[in-house]
């Protein structure tokens, strides 16, 4: 299809290479057609441009990404060529950065309803750079934590090192959809409640003697819990002693609760005691089983592929720590009569 | 949608036996001890005894020791087997998860099984 | 086997009211912790609200809270509603499985 119709937007993504980040692209169909389609406001009022109305569709994922080639090459369609770059709804998620990523990015609703649908489109324009300002040592991250039930703000990392004084008009948006009262480049939260996590995206508009465009950064926020004041606590195995048949295989679980850690090194690993004796078997790999905001449940198995005499003679100990110290706690086995 | 169904339960005449089964769907069970816990009616819950599907290692209540075995029959489902039955076993019987042997998280139940003991 | 005795039935609350239910057990729980309390309304299986004596189950109003440690627990619910009328158990873990019990149950009659 012809794209010289299409609306364009420039869009900056300067990337930090100490971090991994994400970016997004939102579908900007110019309104009203957007109200049709997509169920979100993105736009300013000073951004929307004056366009024929849309007969879109309402399912959100009723559009369809292509990428330019440089060397103008026909329209690639993003879902196949690009594993990297994921389609959600009206909105792209970069996954990686890097200057691969620069290009042309059009969107446009799938289904064509009626003749003037088919200029509904929107042409970005991406260029990716690697951050070079070195003078802002402590810019804001791309993952931020937010303390539940104290207050806490969330910065835009392209704005942090800048006073409010200084800040261009920012705007906002959560999970794709327009925070219209916030314009600084700082929103501040006077409580943390868990509704406050999820993906934020900053834009500011930046000029030079030819044109302008929009510089985008992308922030996963997170609401936390305090880091917990515990050793871990093991679940499982409760009892000291287990009945086992002879020459029967054995699989012994130890599971353990370990609260939140905002810097999180569980260790859980078996080891085996034997008269004086002591060693770390070599077990499968530990596995998160449940995960809440306040706690995860790890489990590692150990695996016996037949009880044996000498096995009736050793204790299995499972060993678990934290930061804040460990747990253990030892089997032995028993022979089952009868 | 984490799921867990009895089934198996209705009328068995005293000194009888019955089979009640507890099928699981929806999430990996292998992390998870199930329990059986029954409700004769208009009474309290009364803990029967669990098994740890990893290696169906089996715990009872003292009272629930001999005349009743859980087990293991497949990689979804658990049974309770109940022998040498009286009226005083009349009640509905449930099963749960729970990822320990002690009583830690029993967040998921069935909706139970009615069983009847009478002549 | 080990005993939890809970604060006799029934205990009424006005809405809006605050009830408070104990529970004491023979012996202490594993961990200190091992304490959950259940809700049952009739013809439904039992709801579990609190784990972990004061751990708060996935979905549960935040009005239910649990306190207590050892062989002393407590289920507090505030600001109590028409639909908080039902029977409330409470559960404990030991070290020898095989003595895990429920309590009694407590019903709330809710004026």
């Known amino acids: 299809f012809n794209i010289s119709g299409c609306s364009t937007k420039k869009l900056l993504w300067t990337y930090s290479t100490r971090s991994e980040e994400e970016f997004v692209l939102f579908c900007d169909l110019p309104e009203p057609q957007k109200s049709h389609f997509c169920h979100r406001n993105r736009l300013s009022p000073k951004q929307v441009p004056e366009h024929l109305p849309f007969m879109g569709s309402n399912d959100l994922s009723d559009v369809q990404w292509y990428q330019q080639p440089s060397n103008g090459d026909p329209l690639e369609d993003i879902r196949k060529s690009y594993p990297h770059i994921i389609q959600d709804k009206c909105t792209l998620h970069f996954l990686t950065p890097g200057v691969n990523n620069s290009g042309s990015y059009i969107c446009r609703p799938k289904m064509i309803k009626s003749p003037y649908d088919v200029a509904c489109c929107v042409k970005m324009i991406l260029e990716v750079k690697p951050q070079t300002n070195a003078s802002c040592e402590y810019s804001a991250s791309h993952k931020q934590d937010l303390l539940l039930g104290s207050t806490g703000s969330i910065s835009c990392p392209s704005l942090s090192c800048q006073s409010d004084a200084q800040s261009p008009a920012v705007t906002w948006y959560k999970n794709g959809k327009l925070l219209s009262v916030e314009r600084s480049n700082r929103i501040v939260v006077d409580e943390v409640y868990d509704y406050h996590q999820g993906t934020y995206v900053c834009d500011y508009t930046q000029s030079d003697t030819v044109s302008s465009w929009t510089v985008r950064a992308v922030v996963q926020v997170r609401t936390i819990v305090g880091d917990t004041k515990l050793k871990p606590d093991i679940l499982d195995p409760v009892e000291d002693t287990l009945e086992v048949e002879l020459g029967k295989p054995l699989t012994i679980s130890c599971k353990a609760r370990f609260g939140f850690e905002r810097v999180f090194n569980p260790v859980i690993k078996w080891y085996i005691k034997d008269s004086d004796l002591e060693w770390e078997v070599s077990v499968p790999e530990a596995k998160s089983i449940k995960s809440t905001l306040k706690d995860e449940i790890i489990e590692r198995n150990i695996i016996l592929e037949k009880v044996t005499q000498r096995d009736l003679r050793r204790k299995f100990v499972c060993f678990v720590q934290n930061s804040i110290g460990n747990t253990t706690q030892s089997v032995q086995l028993k022979e089952k009569r009868g | 949608q984490e799921q867990l169904e009895e089934s198996g339960g209705g009328l068995v005449k005293p000194e009888g036996s019955l089979t009640l089964t507890c099928k699981a769907s929806?999430?990996?069970?292998?992390?998870?001890?199930i329990y059986w816990v029954r409700q004769a009616p208009g009474k309290g819950l009364e803990w029967i005894g669990c098994?740890?599907?990893?290696?169906?290692?089996t715990y009872y209540a003292n009272w629930a020791k001999g005349r009743f075995t859980i087990s293991k029959t497949s990689s979804t489902t658990v049974t309770l087997q109940m022998t040498s039955l009286t009226a005083a076993d009349t009640a509905t019987y449930f099963c749960?998860?729970?990822?320990?042997?002690?009583?830690?998280?029993?967040?998921?139940w069935g909706p139970g099984t009615l069983v009847t003991v009478s002549s | 086997a080990q005993v939890l005795t809970q604060t006799a039935s029934p205990v009424s609350a006005a809405v809006g009211g605050t009830v408070t239910i104990n529970c004491q057990s023979s012996?202490?729980?594993?961990?200190?912790?091992?304490l959950s309390w259940f809700q049952q309304k009739p013809g439904q299986p039992p709801k579990q609200l609190i784990y972990?004596?004061?751990t708060l189950a996935s979905g549960v109003p935040s009005r239910f809270s649990g306190s207590g440690s050892g062989t002393q627990f407590t289920l507090t619910i505030s600001d109590v509603q028409c639909d908080d009328a039902a029977t409330y158990y409470c559960?404990?873990?030991?070290?020898?499985?095989?003595?895990?019990?429920f309590g009694g149950g407590t019903e709330v009659v809710v004026k």
């Open positions: 929806g999430f990996t069970i292998s992390s998870y001890y």
């Open positions: 012996q202490s729980v594993y961990n200190n912790n091992r």
């Open positions: 559960a404990g873990g030991y070290s020898s499985s095989s003595d895990n019990a």
């Open positions: 749960a998860r729970d990822l320990s042997s002690s009583i830690y998280d029993m967040d998921l």
């Open positions: 972990r004596s004061s």
């Open positions: 098994i740890a599907i990893i290696n169906s290692i």
